[in-house]
Amino acid sequence: SQVSNLLKQQQTNLTHQKNKLEGQISARQQAEEASQESQNELKEMIETLAWKLNEKSKEQMELHHQNLNLQETLKRVANCSAPCPQDWIWHEENCYLFSTGSFNWEKSQEKCLSLDAKLLKINSTADLDFIQQAISYSSFPFWMGLSRRNPSYPWLWEDGSPLMPHLFRIRGAVSQTYPSGTCAYIQRGAVYAENCILAAFSICQKKANLRAQ
Amino acid sequence: SQVSNLLKQQQTNLTHQKNKLEGQISARQQAEEASQESQNELKEMIETLAWKLNEKSKEQMELHHQNLNLQETLKRVANCSAPCPQDWIWHEENCYLFSTGSFNWEKSQEKCLSLDAKLLKINSTADLDFIQQAISYSSFPFWMGLSRRNPSYPWLWEDGSPLMPHLFRIRGAVSQTYPSGTCAYIQRGAVYAENCILAAFSICQKKANLRAQ
């Protein structure tokens, strides 16, 4: 009976220790889960920061290139004569002429070529902003140097370069095929596709004369 | 004795369980330490990335300022020898700017003044021909620098000189009297009189920089 009591006491102690240990394990388990969660959040934060850093690097690279170009232009621009001929508009590195006659796309192209220029090419959102502003007081369409043979072909500028998809959406007769091809015009700030055979105003463009004399 | 054996057996079981739990706690403790270490590494990584991002932002800001300075310089340098500033049209001895906003006559006049210019003045039929051609693709009205207080007063340009009668006929509200005066606008090649309080586009004009370089 004495032995039995002793054993019972030990047993109670052990049960108490076991319960205590189980409680510790449960607490550690919760802590572990919280730690895992926190770790996942940290990893997510790292991913976000890494992405942001990558984006910043890209932006910086772009700014750096812009900088180099500006420095180059600045070198050229020192001591130069008229950047553009009379009646043309000088903007940034280009000269623009808004035609005063209405012609089909091919004829408009020829008119520009005779002036040592090409039909309008939009390279950036800044170019687009300028043109949209320059034609803001007109409700007429203006041919630009963008065309394609049919809907299965890409939109190409006169120099053969493709249209950057983010620049603008082309509306209108985009799904149409015409014997003379499909050409793009800009009107009230939006770009439309239409039969190249139609007569419209146009915008000629050429490099501004920013060379050192 | 039977009870005693049973208790001993339970005690053995409990001891075994206790040892097992202690082992688990020890393992979890090690895992926790490793997790803590890994978390510290992640935090360190975050700190590094955040620092790098901050540095990149500073560099980018610097590049951006450099860029703005270069653009500013480019505009200044380029304007030195160019007959007209960017976005203006050079024709003969003048520079012309077609406003991109719609304002009343007085506000339009102020806008031109802020650009070191005046509202359009037509001195000759050649000037008129150029302007008519330049706005041929617009159906909107453009204020010019011609106004009069009421029908008993003569039409005067901004510089106080009178309108040459042979240049053009003024149509529209010629016999009307308005508290703000009567102003002239050009639209589709014809000149009209209207209440100066109305909003319209406008044409600014200033002398071209044709000094010997």
Epitope: S139, P141, R171, A173, T177, S180, Q187, Y192, E194, L198 | -
Partner: antibody, heavy 119, light 111 residues
Framework: QVQLLESGGGLVQPGGSLRLSCAAS????????LHWVRQAPGKGLEWVSV????????YYADSVKGRFTISRDNSKNTLYLQMNSLRAEDTAVYYC????????????WGQGTLVTVSS | DIVLTQPPSVSGAPGQRVTISCSGS????????VSWYQQLPGTAPKLLIH???HRPSGVPDRFSGSKSGTSASLAITGLQAEDEADYYC???????????FGGGTKLTVLG
């Protein structure tokens, strides 16, 4: 589905005016060129006018030039034809039709509205 | 002033093949596409063929279009009673800058 619904027809005296409307639904209105085509009683189809997506290109048949004006309101999805100085020979059923391109085919037509010019 | 020339009428028995011609010039059919429309009595015209030979969905393949030089033609095979209608050709004339229609052809299904 695509729907074009003309209205505004009726009896008018020679020299009078009338304004036709064509309400469109079931498609992106501003992505299509719109035409007016008429048909005199017992006769064939005669094209009247076309207007491009934003009204930049507008063309008329010689028979209506200077008298008729085509317009559109993209915010209201509606095409209009303002007819002035009407003549007996303008008597016809007037259809509005949509085109995916200004010079291309008419893939949808309205049911038509009758204009009668008579004294 | 009809610019595109069509025969005023054509006829054929059920099951037969008929063709409708459309003659133009270099400024319309010669340099642009041709479309064909069917107009059943008392209804609005319906597009049958576009871009010379393309059939919109829902148009039976008994209808076909072709173009050669300054002329175009519409062929209908396996003629059916419900094909009895007026048929019009259409193109764009770039010289006069307008849409041009043919005078229309009345198709009669005999029998």
């Amino acid at each position: 589905q695509v729907q074009l619904l003309e209205s505004g027809g009726g009896l008018v005296q020679p020299g009078g005016s009338l304004r036709l409307s064509c309400a469109a639904s079931g498609f992106t209105f501003s992505d299509y060129a719109l035409h007016w085509v008429r048909q005199a009683p017992g006769k064939g189809l005669e094209w009247v006018s076309v207007i491009s997506y934003q009204g930049g290109f507008i063309y008329y048949a010689d028979s209506v030039k200077g008298r008729f004006t085509i317009s559109r309101d993209n915010s209201k999805n509606t095409l209009y034809l303002q007819m002035n100085s009407l003549r007996a020979e303008d008597t016809a059923v007037y259809y509005c039709a949509r085109s995916p391109g200004l010079t291309s085919y008419h893939d949808s037509w309205g049911q038509g509205t009758l204009v009668t010019v008579s004294s | 002033d009809i610019v595109l020339t069509q025969p005023p009428s054509v006829s054929g028995a059920p099951g037969q093949r008929v063709t409708i011609s459309c003659s133009g010039s270099s400024s319309n059919i010669g340099s642009n596409y041709v479309s064909w429309y069917q107009q059943l009595p008392g209804t609005a015209p319906k597009l049958l063929i576009h871009s010379n030979s393309h059939r919109p969905s829902g148009v039976p393949d008994r209808f076909s279009g072709s173009k050669s030089g300054t002329s175009a033609s519409l062929a209908i095979t396996g003629l059916q009673a419900e094909d009895e209608a007026d048929y019009y050709c259409q193109s764009w004339d770039y010289e006069s800058e307008r849409v041009v229609f043919g005078g229309g052809t009345k198709l009669t299904v005999l029998g």
